[in-house]
């Protein structure tokens, strides 16, 4: 019947669209994976350095506290709050040093997270442009198929054609706006 003919003719166009979209998405995933690996490799030395410094600070803190602990154990009569007063500056010093290391790490990592965000934004922009062009192409093909069919079965298909074209158009619009929304979200992070 007319409907099965229509399905036959539209089938390859729809399938081609989804196949291409899948390829585009897979390409984006692989490129992003590569970007992440590159950034990780650049960042790793800073993380290793941060861990080493953190361990050193902990070790120094233990050494500085040990004389106080030893004296207390040996029976030096000392009120608890006096001990806390002595420990407090050491704790503050360690916290300040740790904060300095964290700040240094944050400073080192900032350019890489920006770079990653920009790369992803560029990839999505490219996908949006390619996707938009392809959707227009499929839209044209579908229109052409419908026109050919409608010559043969004009009365039966006219209503169907009128209903289907807006559906394709709205799919195109919603696909592009979803991509646009994701790009915006990415840029505001």
């Amino acid at each position: 019947s007319t409907f099965s003919k229509l399905r036959e003719q539209l089938g390859p166009v729809t399938q081609e669209f989804w196949d291409n979209l899948e390829k585009e998405t897979e390409g984006l995933r692989q490129e992003m994976s590569k970007d992440l690996e590159e950034v990780k490799a650049k960042v790793q030395p800073y993380l290793d350095d941060f861990q080493k410094k953190w361990q050193e600070e902990m070790e120094l803190y233990r050494q500085k506290v040990e004389p106080l602990r030893a004296e207390l154990q040996e029976g030096a009569r000392q009120k608890l709050h006096e001990l806390q007063e002595k420990l407090s500056p050491l704790g503050e010093e360690m916290r300040d040093r740790a904060r300095a290391h964290v700040d240094a790490l944050r400073t080192h990592l900032a350019p890489y997270s920006d770079e990653l965000r920009q790369r992803l934004a560029a990839r999505l922009e490219a996908l949006k442009e390619n996707g938009g062009a392809r959707l227009a192409e499929y839209h044209a093909k579908a229109t052409e198929h419908l026109s050919t069919l409608s010559e043969k079965a004009k009365p039966a298909l006219e209503d169907l054609r009128q209903g289907l074209l807006p559906v394709l158009e709205s799919f195109k619009v919603s696909f592009l706006s979803a991509l646009e929304e994701y790009t915006k979200k990415l840029n505001t992070q």
Partner: nanobody, 115 residues
Framework: QVQLVESGGGLVQPGGSLRLSCAAS????????MSWARQAPGRQREWVTS???????DYADSVKGRFTISRDNANNTVYLQMNNLKPEDSAVYYC?????????WGQGTQVTVSS
């Protein structure tokens, strides 16, 4: 357990220098962090300086620029070079380390700075 023995203490005039040594023996599998502390009569025992396995050093503000800690890993010995000594540096100086949460202390060596 690690055994620590200090030496090199003595009587010195203000402005003078002394070099303390701390020899470690026992089970030492790596270069542990080694430290010096001191205690004057009637005073709190205080941390003076440390040298980490990496070679990094740290000093109490009161001795910065005057004292230098160093180590000889081959002989398991730590040194404390004390220059421009002041009367307030007079104390018993102890060498110590904390290995796997276990502290080990030497018996101490007396340093007296007096004219």
């Amino acid at each position: 357990q690690v055994q620590l023995v200090e030496s090199g203490g003595g009587l010195v005039q203000p402005g003078g220098s002394l070099r303390l040594s701390c020899a470690a023996s026992g089970t030492i599998t790596r270069s542990p962090t080694m430290s010096w502390a001191r205690q004057a009569p009637g005073r709190q025992r205080e941390w003076v300086t440390s040298i980490l396995g990496t070679g990094r050093t740290d000093y109490a503000d009161s001795v910065k620029g005057r004292f230098t800690i160093s180590r000889d890993n081959a002989n398991n010995t730590v040194y404390l070079q004390m220059n421009n000594l002041k009367p307030e540096d007079s104390a018993v100086y102890y060498c110590y380390t904390v290995l796997n949460g276990r502290p080990s202390w030497g018996q101490g060596t007396q340093v007296t700075v007096s004219s």
